[in-house]
């Protein structure tokens, strides 16, 4: 009789495993854009290609107006790479003339916007110096980590200088997320 106490454990009902192919996911790629006005202390957000070439959105993950929209709550892996390019000749001009419009560093930020919270949240940030590298420089910044997100959250990528972003190839600059 004692053994029967354990019998029900063999009849436990397990929730069926969800197929990975059903989970929300998106991979967005670089798209050409003209630099726009932005507030002094706020980095501009990038637009993304969402359906051409390597880009896609699947399973209710949608892209609209710079934002990736999270369709259901859960743990997501979020990633982005932004490749910047420029010329070091700009750096000596910065140091000599103190020109604030030519940066000596580049920054990428992945930002979360939640309607119920007034301020955007910085999830990931990466910064590199660009005035130490060669004459025609290329610098990728890659960011990626897991975050717990809520349905309705919006993700965007902000950069310190849109004009330095390399838009020439879709495998150089990209942004994505998928539900784990």
């Amino acid at each position: 009789l004692k053994g029967q106490e354990f019998a029900p454990s063999h009849q436990q009902v397990y929730a069926p495993l969800r197929a990975d192919g059903d989970k929300p996911r998106a991979h967005l790629t670089v798209v050409r854009q003209t630099p726009t006005q932005h507030f002094k202390n706020q980095f501009p957000a990038l637009h993304w290609e969402h359906e051409l070439g390597l880009a896609f959105t699947k399973n209710r993950m949608n892209y609209t107006n710079k934002f990736l929209l999270i369709p259901e709550s859960g743990d997501y892996f979020i990633y982005s790479q932004v490749t910047f390019r420029g010329m070091t000749s700009e750096c000596s001009e910065i140091r000599q003339a103190g020109r604030p419009n030519k940066p000596d560093s580049i920054t990428v930020v992945i930002t979360k916007v939640t309607d119920s919270y007034p301020e955007p949240t910085q999830l990931l940030m990466g910064t590199k110096s660009v005035c130490e590298v060669g004459s025609n420089w290329f610098q990728p910044i890659y960011l990626g980590a897991m975050f717990s997100l809520q349905e309705g959250d919006k993700l965007m990528v902000n950069v310190s200088d849109i004009s330095l972003v390399d838009y020439t190839k879709e495998d150089k600059t990209f942004f994505g997320a998928f539900l784990l």
Partner: antibody
Framework: QVQLVQSGAEVKKPGASVKVSCKVS????????VHWVREAPGQGLEWMGV???????DYNSKFQGRVTMTRDTSTNTVYMELSSLRSEDTAVYYC??????????????????WGQGTLVTVSS | DIQMTQSPSSVSASVGDRVTITCRAS??????LAWYQKKPGKSPKLLIY???SLQDGVPSRFSGSGSGTDYTLTISSLQPEDFATYFC?????????FGQGTKLEIK
């Protein structure tokens, strides 16, 4: 790298049809939009239509009923057929891969990549 | 359909000159304008998109400006290889109309 290679020159009689091919490499026709533009002597550039990546088409109303765009995904080739040819259809026909760009929050289309062009001469 | 009107239809200039070509749309195209260079027997080459952004690999002597319905392409100092025909194109909606072209000739 992105390349669009078009078929060779054609000479056609009025009333006939012509089918120009555009074989692409460096991208898939199922993932990018391919447009057709022509340049008639002294007429400038004229947009004819597009084969969208999803296989639907959109034609300039000027050519509606005379133009048909198709594709073969196995060979990564797009075709443009123009029927009921007349002398004023004598032109160089180009295929082009469209590119999207943003200004503020609106997006627009331009043509960063072009085929080499196909001369179609319509003459009796 | 949106109509695109370029002026002048032709212009004569010398190497080193500054040249300006204008393009007017029949309605507001919200800076959705591209400029192309076309040489005889060659395919068009994209120079400018978004009215003012230089396409990758295009020399900085080319610049674009404008908004609403009126747009300008400027070549700051003409080089021998710049003698060609230039077209504007609206990218807002089908049928993505081109201007009739401006032929830039050697004076």
């Amino acid at each position: 790298q992105v390349q669009l290679v078009q078929s060779g020159a054609e000479v056609k009689k009025p009333g006939a049809s012509v089918k120009v091919s555009c074989k692409v490499s460096g991208f898939s026709v199922t993932r990018y939009n391919v447009h057709w533009v022509r340049e008639a002597p002294g007429q400038g550039l004229e947009w004819m239509g597009v084969m969208w990546s999803g296989a639907n088409t959109d034609y300039n109303s000027k050519f509606q009923g005379r133009v048909t765009m198709t594709r073969d995904t196995s060979t990564n080739t797009v075709y443009m057929e123009l029927s009921s040819l007349r002398s004023e259809d004598t032109a160089v026909y180009y295929c082009a891969r469209a590119g999207r760009y943003y200004v503020d929050s609106n997006y627009y289309w331009d043509f960063p990549y072009w085929g080499q062009g196909t001369l179609v001469t319509v003459s009796s | 359909d949106i109509q695109m009107t370029q002026s002048p239809s032709s212009v004569s200039a010398s190497v080193g000159d500054r040249v300006t070509i204008t393009c007017r749309a029949s309605e507001d195209i919200y800076s959705g304008l591209a400029w192309y260079q076309k040489k005889p027997g060659k395919s068009p080459k994209l120079l400018i998109y978004g009215a003012s952004s230089l396409q990758d690999g295009v020399p900085s002597r080319f610049s674009g400006s404008g908004s609403g319905t009126d747009y300008t392409l400027t070549i700051s100092s003409l080089q021998p290889e710049d003698f060609a025909t230039y077209f504007c194109q609206e990218g807002l909606k089908s049928p993505y109309t081109f201007g009739q072209g401006t032929k830039l000739e050697i004076k």
